[in-house]
Interface confidence: medium
Amino acid sequence: AEEQLEGGLRTAKDGPAAAKAAVRFHLRTSKGPEREGCYLSVGHSQPLEDCSFNMTAKTFFIIHGWTMSGMLENWLHKLVSALQMREKDANVVVVDWLPLAHQLYTDAVNSTRVVGLSVAKMLDWLQGKDGFSLGNVHLIGYSLGAHVAGFAGNFVKGTVGRITGLDPAGPMFEGVDIHRRLSPDDADFVDVLHTYTRSFGISIGIQMPVGHIDIYPNGGDFQPGCGLNDVLGSIAYGTIAEVVKCEHERAVHLFVDSLVNQDKPSFAFQCTDSNRFKKGICLSCRKNRCNGIGYNAKKTRNKRNTKMYLKTRAGMPFRVYHYQMKIHFFSYKSVGAIEPTFYVTLYGTNAESQVLSLEIVEQIGLNATNTFLVYTEEDLGDLLKIKLTWEGTSRSWYDLWREFRSYLSQPHRPERELSIRRIRVKSGETQRRLTFCVEDPEKTSIAPGQELWFYKCRDGWRMKNETSPTVEL
């Protein structure tokens, strides 16, 4: 692998000897987190004893990415603390490759293989120690560090237990073959969080799936709380750089959240793409179709490159509660292409939700069942009832005149009116299905500016007189 590696480097000065001096392994054990002098070095066993390295425990390697500041950033210290809190006996090793990372981004990229080789050599040496198992090793790499972890997993003798890629870097890695980036072959389990994947400009995070499971919170692009206004509170100094940092680094904070908020785990759902997820189609947990995120992600028997999605809050704890809503809109006359704005409020045994918008991803299908995704920040408990509101839109005089003429010719029904008999709801987190019916079966119509109430009428989705799942009453 080393010969292969040398061939891939731009210049000889970037080779393994240079990397040896530029890569340091800082051991942070829970027993002595304040001991700053615990640096591991291949061939030197004394620091392992001095710093209470636990050979049989889990060992985490945290690998930072490219840096313009030349310093270890704040997220790293938070991640170290969170790991130590969650896994009290574990060894936490910070891979400090700042001298090589504090370069032009492209030059830092060219150093990732050699840094990965350094990590692999450290692991190979540790494997010679009694009780140490590569299966207990978990490499956690952020941005460029995710690819360093991939190279380490590729070069090590044996198979690392797990690699977590926290928004692996995109530029110079997007679309390249598996030996030149993080890939599922690099560990027994490779899970990835993608938080900055953009289709315009330059995507700082890699867009393509690179692990066994690839999780795209909020579609992997716009992270709540990271808009220009959110980042600094004022547009004047809210720069794109701050937005980039916020969204790119969100992957780290989601991982930290999964460590510290064990009682509020977030779940992601398998889906072919972000648009289908936004439609609420993908909230199934059958056949390993849902999984915890971050530290709580479980290795599944699925093949590789499983794309998963979830929504999150703007800050910790990030967990939200996902609901799929199925609504059949009946239309008794041709109303043309309408783009109604619907809102729902969910009422549960614990709380009621805020007013939630039903996002229309494509177009409302009339005389068809439409699926929506809604999510709440609070745990509502068992759902009891739903209020559906059709927002009244401002109308032109021409629209009003047309509606008035229509009323004269057919006074019993306004032109823009839909009928809804029930709403079917599925909770992503509990997988419970519920059906909500209108209180009065005679009063099912709704027009702009009006609301309809639906009450829980059964557990499950099939009504007594339904003979097949495809029949819509």
């Epitope: 731009r10 313009m68 500041s69 032009l104 492209t106 030059d107 701050e242 980039v244």
Partner: antibody, heavy 119, light 107 residues
Framework: QVQLQQSGAELVKPGASVRLSCKAS????????IHWVKQRSGQGLEWIGW????????KYNEKFKDKATLTADKSSRTVYMELSRLTSEDSAVYFC????????????WGQGTLVTVSA | DIQMTQTTSSLSASLGDRVTISCRAS??????LNWYQQQPDGTVKLLIY???RLHSGVPSRFSGSGSGTDYSLTISNLEQEDIATYFC?????????FGGGTNLEIK
């Protein structure tokens, strides 16, 4: 909006030194690298080096390592370039420009400072 | 150092023409290629970054393409204000290097 305001033209004698300034406004000064670029009359552009105010990190083009010295004053949001032991070869327009991370491009440029070295 | 070559140092075209300016790198630069416009008064502006991404405020008649070592800038419908000198620059590795420039003038 982002602006880089450069100091005025300089006429200097051979062997002397000159200090050019580039004052930044409209963004968080410590978050972006400032680069310096040289353009001799009617010729192309040459990259001199960068200064990153966030950590006082400096990188030079080997060719200019003994010619240019980059410094900054964070309080006035200004980056300086001192050119020493001037010769007629140093007569040129010098631009400062702001680096865009990841894309390695120079998105915003100063108006340039003309340095003329003449006895 | 990576050499950047703009083979055409001067180019004449008519208003409304489609103009293409090319740039070649001495080695693969992985799409880290940027285009700049220097106006007659000396003002320098970024047009295209990372081979094909349009910088904010740049008219859509400008476009970029290429990969590996060969890159080009296209102006689809030449306007009077486009009369300037165009430089390519590689941001792949230090030192950053620029092409010699292509001076665009009206026929």
């Amino acid at each position: 909006q982002v602006q880089l305001q450069q100091s005025g033209a300089e006429l200097v004698k051979p062997g002397a030194s000159v200090r050019l300034s580039c004052k930044a406004s409209g963004y968080t000064f410590t978050k972006y690298t400032i680069h310096w670029v040289k353009q001799r009359s009617g010729q192309g552009l040459e990259w001199i080096g960068w200064f990153y105010p966030g950590s006082d990190s400096i990188k030079y083009n080997e060719k200019f390592k003994d010619k240019a010295t980059l410094t900054a004053d964070k309080s006035s949001r200004t980056v300086y370039m001192e050119l020493s032991r001037l010769t007629s070869e140093d007569s040129a327009v010098y631009f400062c420009a702001r680096h865009e991370e990841y894309t390695n491009s120079l998105a915003y440029w100063g108006q340039g400072t003309l340095v003329t070295v003449s006895a | 150092d990576i050499q950047m070559t703009q083979t055409t140092s001067s180019l004449s075209a008519s208003l409304g023409d489609r103009v293409t300016i090319s740039c070649r790198a001495s080695q693969d630069i992985s799409n880290y290629l940027n285009w700049y416009q220097q106006q007659p008064d000396g003002t320098v502006k970024l047009l295209i970054y990372y081979t094909s991404r349009l910088h904010s405020g740049v008219p859509s008649r400008f476009s970029g393409s290429g990969s590996g070592t060969d890159y080009s800038l296209t102006i689809s419908n030449l306007e009077q204000e486009d009369i300037a000198t165009y430089f390519c620059q590689q941001g792949y590795t230090l030192p950053w290097t620029f092409g010699g420039g292509t001076n665009l003038e009206i026929k």
